[in-house]
């Protein structure tokens, strides 16, 4: 991954945090929050973008080269976009317009852009569809989509604030 | 894996109720979309209910939206369907499933209970 110019950690910071709030609000859970279910081999298996420990989100990996972790995000952010997209949620029960859902959508959208202003190539990515027998899975898929999102955002915003406070280039004073 | 062990049933005259309980032992119990499920004689399998991991989404089948409810206890590792105006067509074997897939993208009621007889008499 080449190094190039560093994403305005501040703005990030922002909305990475906004990010985290509208996810809660579009499936605030009853009870506590509890971590998510996760395997080693689940990554490769599912094609499910996560923040894991080589991929350069650690203080010092953001140091040496934020583009690494950078570029997780940016995966992630896609994909969970592409996920809000897909007849998961587009189906019935349908989203009202405005609803927090709505918003994160937007909010997903507005965080991609400023980490990726260029257009990329899109990935092609299978999303998952539900036959006319299956659609009562859909509140189901929604759920665990939502929380998955959630843990996901929850160490982005982490990674953004690190870099808002340590990497940010410092205002050089003019005369 | 999660083991899963279905209870309540029995025979009940048409218009009356009945609660299944669904106990879990052997896995991290809070984090399974739980679901319920039933099966009559010389018929396939079918969709009943389920819930989600924290109980705050919840999804039904046609035939018994307004008359069943699940519900979980994730304190008690437990999930329940308490049936309500139950009909003779309600008649069928109740099983309990658990949500297997680690993956946010897919549903797999890969694991399953014994199954619990529930008899509805007109």
């Known amino acids: 991954v080449p190094r190039s110019s560093s994403p305005d950690w501040a703005q990030c910071q922002q909305l990475s945090r906004n990010l985290c709030m509208l996810a809660w609000n579009a499936h605030a859970p009853a009870g506590h929050m509890n971590l998510l279910r996760e395997e080693e081999d689940e990554e490769t298996k599912n094609n499910v973008p996560r923040i894991q420990c080589e991929d350069g989100c650690d203080p010092q990996g953001l140091k040496d080269n934020s583009q690494f972790c950078l570029q997780r995000i940016r995966q992630g952010l896609a994909f969970y976009k592409h996920l809000l997209d897909s007849d998961i949620f587009k189906g019935e029960p349908a989203l009202l317009p405005d609803s927090p859902m709505e918003q994160l959508h937007t909010s997903l959208l507005g965080l991609s852009q400023l980490l990726q202003p260029e257009d990329h190539p899109r990935e092609t990515q299978q999303m998952p569809s539900l036959s006319s027998s299956q659609q009562w899975q859909r509140p189901l898929l929604r759920s665990k989509i939502l929380r998955s999102l959630q843990a996901f955002l929850a160490i982005a915003a982490r990674v953004f604030a690190h870099g808002a406070a340590t990497l940010t280039e410092p205002l050089v004073p003019t005369a | 894996e999660v083991q899963l062990v279905e209870s309540g049933g029995g025979l009940v005259q048409a218009g009356g109720s009945l609660r299944l309980s669904c106990a879990a032992s052997?896995?991290?119990?809070?984090?399974?979309?739980m679901g319920w499920f039933r099966q009559a004689p010389g018929k396939e399998r079918d969709f009943v209910a389920a819930?989600?991991?924290?109980?705050?989404?919840?999804t039904y089948a046609d035939s018994v939206k307004g008359r069943f409810t699940i519900s979980r206890d994730n304190a008690k590792n437990t999930v329940y369907l308490q049936m309500n105006s139950l009909k003779p067509e309600d008649t069928a074997v109740y099983y309990c499933?658990?949500?297997?897939?680690?993956?946010?993208?897919?549903?797999?009621?890969?694991?399953w209970g014994q199954g619990t007889q529930v008899t509805v008499s007109s």
């Open positions: 499933a658990a949500d297997m897939s680690h993956s946010p993208i897919e549903i797999d009621f890969g694991s």
């Open positions: 052997g896995g991290t119990f809070s984090s399974y979309a």
């Open positions: 819930i989600d991991w924290s109980g705050s989404t919840t």
